[in-house]
Each structure stands twice: as structure tokens, then as C-alpha cells.
């Protein structure tokens, strides 16, 4: 008796975070024996879509010509071979930006910071929101969440960084969101360039924050230190 069919691979091009109105293609890659591919969306009762495999039959394309709120969500795909259906793929979370107006990102006391000192990035929205995300360009794990507890709405979130090292330098943006759908984000804030200048004794990252030789600093999640700035906000890293 053969074991279960291997699960397919699911991904999105050009990526899984898509601006409103832009196109995105979801790909599901299975095996050469696939007869049919099925894409399921969380909380969608029927198979969300189904397609014939593209030659040589090992993958299928699911096109979204114009991104809207309805397409944002969590997807899985399957393929059917002559012996039955595969295991589900790992989930793909398709996020839409542009659902709300853009927040403002600023640095306190300044975006020019000396290594070893402290800086706080402040993300402010015009309307109250319950989730704020800080992303750093070219980081493999760019999302840092600050999510309010008990649905409390906030106009801003603070992301303290202390002590600052050269690793913290770079371009940041922030987003705001409502908790009822973390797949819907605001327009991105304008970029903020955080410039870290050296000190007489440039402190190295402490062992607890050191990066492995297998990955450079840009591959690490942002891990700012410090107490939670608002009593209503809880920190989440992804």
C-alpha cells in the first residue's frame, strides 16, 4: 500500500502581499501524475477554484486579475492523481494592502541615531486601528505586530529599539489594520530611513541577539527591546 500523496507547494507571484487593484497569480505545484488542481480558501464552502494542470501537468495557475478585499485570506491547494487526492499544501496567506489610508511613520527622537543609544519608531493612523505592523525592507521576516488587547482601538503604536546597532539601520514602513481581518492592511506609510552612526565604542549585539553564521542580519526578525508602549498593545512577532 502506497503512502499518502506528497503535499503540493503553494506560492504567489509577484508575492503574497498585494496592493489593491494589482494582479497576482497563485501557483500550485504537485506531481506529473496530477489530473486536476483545486484551490481552497479558508471559510469558503465550495472549492474556491479548480483548474487543469499546465503541461507537463505538475502545476496549475490560479489568476487574480485585480486584487480586492474578497481575495485576501488563507489558501491551501490539492491535486488529484489517479490514486486520489493529495495532502493539502502548507497555507498561503494572501494579504491586500490599500484597504485603509496610510499611517505616518516617524522616529523619536530622530531617524539619525548613534549606535548604542535608543530610538522609537512611531506609527500613527488617522483613524483608530487595533493592529500596527512595522516592516523593514529586504528582511526575510519583516513583520512585527503590535496588536491591541480586547479590541481596544489605538491611533498609534510605538516600536522601541534599544540598544540600537548597525543591524537596525535601513528603510522601514508601517501599516495599520483592523483585527477582524489581518489580511487587509492600510496603504504603506511613507518610508523612513533609520541611519545608525558609529560610536567611539561601537557595541556588538549581545549573545541573545546574535545572528547565526547561516543567515545574515537581514534574515532575522526585528526584535526591538523595551517595555510595551501602550498598556492596550501586545507585541507579536512573526
Amino acid at each position: 500500500q502506497a503512502g499518502p500523496l506528497p503535499k503540493p507547494t503553494l506560492w504567489a507571484e509577484p508575492g503574497s502581499v498585494i496592493s489593491w487593484g494589482n494582479s497576482v497569480t497563485i501557483w500550485c505545484q504537485g506531481t506529473l501524475e496530477a489530473r486536476e488542481y483545486r484551490l481552497d480558501k479558508e471559510e469558503s464552502p465550495a472549492p474556491w477554484d479548480r483548474q487543469n494542470p499546465l503541461e507537463p501537468k505538475n502545476k496549475a495557475r490560479f489568476s487574480i486579475p485585480s486584487m480586492t478585499e474578497d481575495y485576501a485570506g488563507r489558501y491551501r491547494c490539492y491535486y488529484r492523481s489517479p490514486v486520489g487526492w493529495s495532502q493539502p499544501s502548507d497555507p498561503l496567506e494572501l494579504v491586500m494592502t490599500g484597504a485603509y489610508s496610510k499611517p505616518t511613520l516617524s522616529a523619536l527622537p530622530s531617524p539619525l541615531v548613534t549606535s548604542g543609544k535608543s530610538v522609537t519608531l512611531l506609527c500613527q493612523s488617522r483613524s483608530p486601528m487595533d493592529t500596527f505592523l512595522l516592516i523593514k525592507e529586504r528582511a526575510a521576516h519583516p513583520l512585527l505586530h503590535l496588536r491591541s488587547e480586547h479590541g481596544a482601538q489605538q491611533h498609534q503604536a510605538e516600536f522601541p529599539m534599544s540598544p540600537v546597532t548597525s543591524v537596525h539601520g535601513g528603510t522601514y514602513r508601517c501599516f495599520s489594520s483592523h483585527g477582524f481581518s489581518h489580511y487587509l492592511l492600510s496603504h504603506p506609510s511613507d518610508p523612513l530611513e533609520l541611519i545608525v552612526s558609529g560610536s567611539l565604542e561601537d557595541p556588538r549585539p549581545s549573545p541573545t541577539r546574535s545572528v547565526s553564521t547561516a543567515a545574515g542580519p537581514e534574515d532575522q526578525p526585528l526584535m526591538p527591546t523595551g517595555s510595551v508602549p501602550h498598556s492596550g498593545l501586545r507585541r507579536h512577532w512573526e
Partner: antibody, heavy 120, light 107 residues
Framework: QVQLVQSGAEVKKPGASVKVSCKAS????????MHWVRQAPGQGLEWMGE????????NYNEKFKSRVTLTVDKSTSTVYMELSSLRSEDTAVYYC?????????????WGQGTTVTVSS | DIQMTQSPSSLSASVGDRVTITCRAS??????LNWYQQKPGKAPKLLIY???RLHSGVPSRFSGSGSGTEYTLTISSLQPDDFATYYC?????????FGQGTRLEIK
Amino acid sequence: QVQLVQSGAEVKKPGASVKVSCKASGYTFTSYWMHWVRQAPGQGLEWMGEINPSNGRTNYNEKFKSRVTLTVDKSTSTVYMELSSLRSEDTAVYYCARDRYDEGNAMDYWGQGTTVTVSS
Amino acid sequence: DIQMTQSPSSLSASVGDRVTITCRASQDITNYLNWYQQKPGKAPKLLIYYTSRLHSGVPSRFSGSGSGTEYTLTISSLQPDDFATYYCQQGDTLPRTFGQGTRLEIK
């Protein structure tokens, strides 16, 4: 019980368009894809396309892709099939049929059919 | 597209006869084969799905079998209500395609 009720017969001129409706009841409308199949007089069955009522996703037979449009109105549990640039060969009975998405990809319940006559 | 060919195109039989209709696919359809019955002026009705599974309410005198590219519908003992046209349909790939039909007439 599952019921698919289609709109009445239509007579159209060549070059015109026709829009046929199919109202579903007796089951959760958004949980099943819907097919459209046609049958010319004295001929066999020909699959035109399918639509997912929960999100409007469609798959079409290439033969009809440029002329057929399937749409859905969730508020009334109704799917529509519009066929444009009609010609005499489009004279047929048009059926909607519910998909039973499991092994077989069969069509388990059918509408009563809508006769479309294309004549100058 | 997958071509579906039924044989015979028409068939005369008597009440109580055992009847077999064959459907051949142009490629392997992995048992995704369904059978329908249609009477004049009426919509088709699903009889059998996935080669051999009886749709709800269908009498047990109807049965299906086959694999790969060859499939059969068998009516073990014809009843007066069974005289109709029968269609096979593949659900293996898009577009869905039907056989041309087999007309079953009273002898």
C-alpha cells in the same frame, strides 16, 4: 428538496444576446459550483462552463469562451448565462446543473431547461 | 479535449432484458465517469457517478463498471420506465465532455 428553476423560452435574432437565469433553492447555494450545458435539437449534450457561486470564479469551454459569460447574484441564489453574437447554430435547450464536488465531478441536479431559438 | 464515444448509438430491447452500454474515453479518465438518463423533452438525470456509485433514488437494477478508458452501464432487467437516451460524461479534466448518447428503444 433541491430545485433549479430556469427562466422562460427566448426567441432572438442573429447577432443578438440572450441571458438565461437559474434560481436555486433547497440547499446552500454557495456550497456547490453550477454548470451550464446545452443541447441542440436532436443532438447530444455540450458543456459550456461552470461558476462558483461563492466567489464568481469561472471555467469555460474554449469553444464558447469569447461569447459566454457566467455570473451570479448571491442575494437571490441565481446564476446567469449570457451568450452573445447569437447564430442559428445556437438554437438549443440550455440547462443549468449543480455540481456534486466529490469523486466523479458529476452534475447531480438539473434545471428544467430554457429553449433559445435564434431566427431571423 | 477528451473525446467520449458511446456504443451502440441506438439499441432495441424488451422489458426484462439485460442491457449493456459502453463508453470509451480517448484517454484514461481515472474512474471519473458518470451516466445520465434523459427522456424526450426533459432534463437529464444523474444515474451513476464515479464509475459505479448509484445516485440517490436510482433503482439498483442500474450498475456501472470499468476503468482506464473503458466503462459500461448495465441495466439488469429492463423496466418500461427505462426506455430513454443514456449519456456518459467524463469529469476527469476540463472541459467536461459527454458521449453522443445511446437511444434505448422498445423492441
